[in-house]
């Protein structure tokens, strides 16, 4: 069974997600469930850093977009957000919170301010900003 | 799907600030990033920058000294200033969105600089 | 900042017939990050290509776009009327971003 939802405010159409846990999860209460991952969007601004420390005070992470399949609700995400995603200058590599290298072809990585931390938006995109700049951001869990 | 209106007057005086809003029409202000771009009368296109709507800018280098961009999601719009204008900034000015590209434009205002 | 470098800076050609547009930029462009706009006299410009490839939403077939490094082609395959106007490329790779200079396709 599939539930419908539309949740305007944060897909910009209407989305899948499975009604019963049978399908998915368990997840923390009111977050999205969908493929085998958990998904929360958080409305109040942080910065990287700050958004990092709240995920983590919820056993999550920052998103990690490894799937395009997997994670193809991430299509129809409105606006931008924090993810995980951090540059490393020393290698010129982007990685993810838990260390592991940005695979290829993944993300489009478009450079709109001088950074080292990434904004997710739609469609597949990485926006690359200043890490001390306050902006939503989703918090992740791999359900098990 | 959002329309752009940029608004301002048609005449600055040399030596004086520039001063031009964009009016996004609907509620996607936090959905983009946003631009200034301008062209001077006969000549090609020149990225002004761009703000997200956190405030967060990024500034053609030719122009960081004299430009600021600003956003109000509360009225949503974001407004360009450009300072100490001269001739050479006789153009039409357009406001964009980002999102592949720039995907929606403002049908452009044009501004004179003239005593 | 990348310097693009569009040629012809004016193409006379027929409606029917296939344009081609060159853009070339001073240095790569990374991961192919760059658009075409067509400009019409009196209005803004429009998107046409992002990503060197992909078409923007409602735009015809009959435009396409190829390349990666320092060289990009716009391709219109059989010119239509309302294909006359100007036409620039634009890289976002890196800040500050640029436009080219234009090429006009003019009704020979």
């Known amino acids: 069974i599939w539930s419908a939802v539309f949740l305007n405010s944060l897909f910009n159409q209407e989305v899948q997600i499975p009604l019963t846990e049978s399908y998915c999860g368990p997840c923390p209460k009111n977050w999205i469930c969908y493929k085998n991952n958990c998904y929360q969007f958080f409305d109040e601004s942080k910065n990287w850093y700050e958004s990092q420390a709240s995920c983590m005070s919820q056993n999550a992470s920052l998103l990690k977009v490894y799937s395009k399949e997997d994670q193809d609700l991430l299509k129809l995400v409105k606006s931008y957000h924090w993810m995980g995603l951090v540059h490393i200058p020393t290698n010129g590599s982007w990685q993810w919170e838990d260390g592991s290298i940005l695979s290829p072809n993944l993300l489009t990585i478009i450079e709109m301010q001088k950074g080292d931390c990434a904004l997710y938006a739609s469609s597949f995109k990485g926006y690359i900003e200043n890490c001390s700049t306050p902006n939503t951001y989703i918090c992740m869990q791999r359900t098990v | 799907q959002v329309h752009l209106q940029e608004s301002g007057p048609g005449l600055v005086k040399p030596s004086e600030t520039l001063s031009l809003t964009c009016t996004v029409s609907d509620d996607s202000i936090s959905s983009y990033y946003w631009s200034w771009i301008r062209q001077p009368p006969g000549k090609g296109l020149e990225w002004i920058g761009h703000i997200s709507y956190s405030g967060s800018a990024n500034y053609n280098p030719s122009l960081k000294s004299r430009v600021t961009i600003s956003v109000d999601t509360s009225k949503n719009q974001f407004s360009l200033k450009l300072s100490s204008v001269t001739a050479a900034d006789t153009a039409v000015y357009y406001c964009?969105?980002?999102?592949?590209?720039?995907?929606?434009w403002g049908q452009g205002t044009m501004v004179t600089v003239s005593s | 900042e990348i310097v693009l470098t569009q040629s012809p800076g004016t193409l006379s050609l027929s409606p029917g017939e296939r344009a081609t547009l060159s853009c070339r930029a001073s240095?790569?462009?990374?991961?192919?990050?760059l658009a075409w706009y067509q400009q019409k006299p009196g209005q803004a410009p429009r998107l046409l290509i992002y990503g060197a490839s992909s078409r923007a939403t409602g735009i015809p077939d009959r435009f396409s776009g190829s390349g990666s490094g320092t060289d990009f082609t716009l391709t219109i395959s059989r010119l239509e009327p309302e294909d006359f106007a100007v036409y620039y490329c634009?890289?976002?790779?890196?800040?500050?971003?640029?436009f080219g200079q234009g090429t006009k396709v003019e009704i020979k």
């Open positions: 634009q890289q976002y790779g890196s800040s500050p971003w640029t």
């Open positions: 964009a969105n980002w999102d592949d590209a720039f995907n929606i």
């Open positions: 240095q790569s462009v990374s991961s192919s990050y």
